[in-house]
Amino acid sequence: SEVEYIAEVGQNAYLPCSYTPAPPGNLVPVCWGKGACPVFDCSNVVLRTDNRDVNDRTSGRYWLKGDFHKGDVSLTIENVTLADSGVYCCRIQIPGIMNDEKHNVKLVVIKPAKVTPAPTLQRDLTSAFPRMLTTGEHGPAETQTPGSLPDVNLTVSNFFCELQIFTLTNELRDSGATIRTA
């Protein structure tokens, strides 16, 4: 199953992925690749870690900005373009035969809206608005953001109307979601 995340052209996309090191500090290699998770490893690798740190990155736009040493291996793609759209594979390479954890996430990059958003709200929507993706094979996916979010099937223009963003910001606060400001 895939969770779908939205980002606007020119902004940063956040694709969540995490595991719990057991015992704490016992890190395992992780790779991020473009495309659904294949049988082995990652194809079209964009970023790779070893047991200590990131050791391979195909572009300076790919970053792990979370607490890598606690198992937060969420991928941030800076300054996204339409070409960044698609499925990404986060593969947690747990030692052993066929032990890897595989997570597919889908990034949808949208063109900038013509309406200028409120300057205080960071336009990194992917963490705040995962949206449900239903496929014939797997059924509905589960979102990874806690709290009851507002309906994500709003029109794109609604996201960028200042009044809507103000309302949305308050709704998110009420739901307990984190609001990041510039």
Epitope: G35, A36, V39, F40, D41, V87, I97, E137
Partner: antibody, heavy 116, light 107 residues
Framework: EVQLVESGGGLVQPGGSLRLSCAAS????????MSWVRQAPGKGLEWVAN????????YYVDSVKGRFTISRDSAKNSLYLQMNSLRAEDTAMYFC?????????WGQGTLVTVSS | ETVMTQSPATLSVSPGERATLSCRAS??????LAWYQRKPGQAPRLLIY???TRATGIPARFSGSGSGTEFTLTISSLQSEDFAVYYC?????????FGGGTKVEIK
């Protein structure tokens, strides 16, 4: 330039053994999975086995499990396939390939013939 | 295992014409599909991976499309050097499997 050169093929009787080798150059051998793929006369391609960068994971197609063993030596940039209890149906051209789940570089192959 | 079925088994085409090769998977392989070219006495050559991405050095006349279970390799204008056998291969499901091949021959 990436190069993969196989050796060790030949004629062997059913039940016999052979060890294939593949010498790799032109890329960082220790950074890639490696595979053996074969093609029987008049047939299509068949993936046989592969091995992780550090040798910690090895996978085999069902038809060779328990008979073939894949291994690697990163110090020598070499890949191996030990083939035991060979059968007539193992007759094929065996290719060494760099494995990215798909196979982006291949050797020219070495022919294994199992016949009495 | 995921069975890959290629059609037609043989395709007779004149130089300069378009060739369309089909590959069908018995279950979804997402976009994790590659195409190879094999000529007699030569090693297979990777043409396409990730369903539609051309490998390094592959001419633009080769293109791939499809996802899920239906895939197509198109050669827009066949050159003399393109007459060969073409194989698809899925790498989404265990084990890795190839199609039976399509022979593209001169008409």
């Amino acid at each position: 330039e990436v190069q993969l050169v196989e050796s060790g093929g030949g004629l062997v009787q059913p039940g016999g053994s052979l060890r294939l080798s593949c010498a790799a150059s032109g890329f960082t051998f220790s950074s890639y999975w490696m595979s053996w793929v074969r093609q029987a006369p008049g047939k299509g391609l068949e993936w046989v086995a592969n091995i992780k960068q550090d040798g910690s994971e090895k996978y085999y197609v069902d038809s060779v499990k328990g008979r073939f063993t894949i291994s690697r030596d990163s110090a020598k940039n070499s890949l191996y396939l030990q083939m035991n209890s060979l059968r007539a149906e193992d007759t094929a051209m065996y290719f060494c390939a760099r494995d990215s789940n798909f196979f982006d570089y291949w050797g020219q192959g070495t022919l294994v013939t199992v016949s009495s | 295992e995921t069975v890959m079925t290629q059609s037609p088994a043989t395709l007779s085409v004149s130089p300069g014409e378009r060739a369309t090769l089909s590959c069908r998977a018995s279950q979804s392989v997402s976009s994790n599909l590659a195409w190879y070219q094999r000529k007699p006495g030569q090693a297979p050559r990777l043409l396409i991976y990730f369903s539609s991405t051309r490998a390094t050095g592959i001419p633009a006349r080769f293109s791939g499309s499809g996802s899920g279970t239906e895939f197509t390799l198109t050669i827009s204008s066949l050159q003399s050097e393109d007459f060969a056998v073409y194989y698809c291969q899925q790498y989404n499901n265990w084990p890795l499997t190839f199609g039976g091949g399509t022979k593209v021959e001169i008409k």
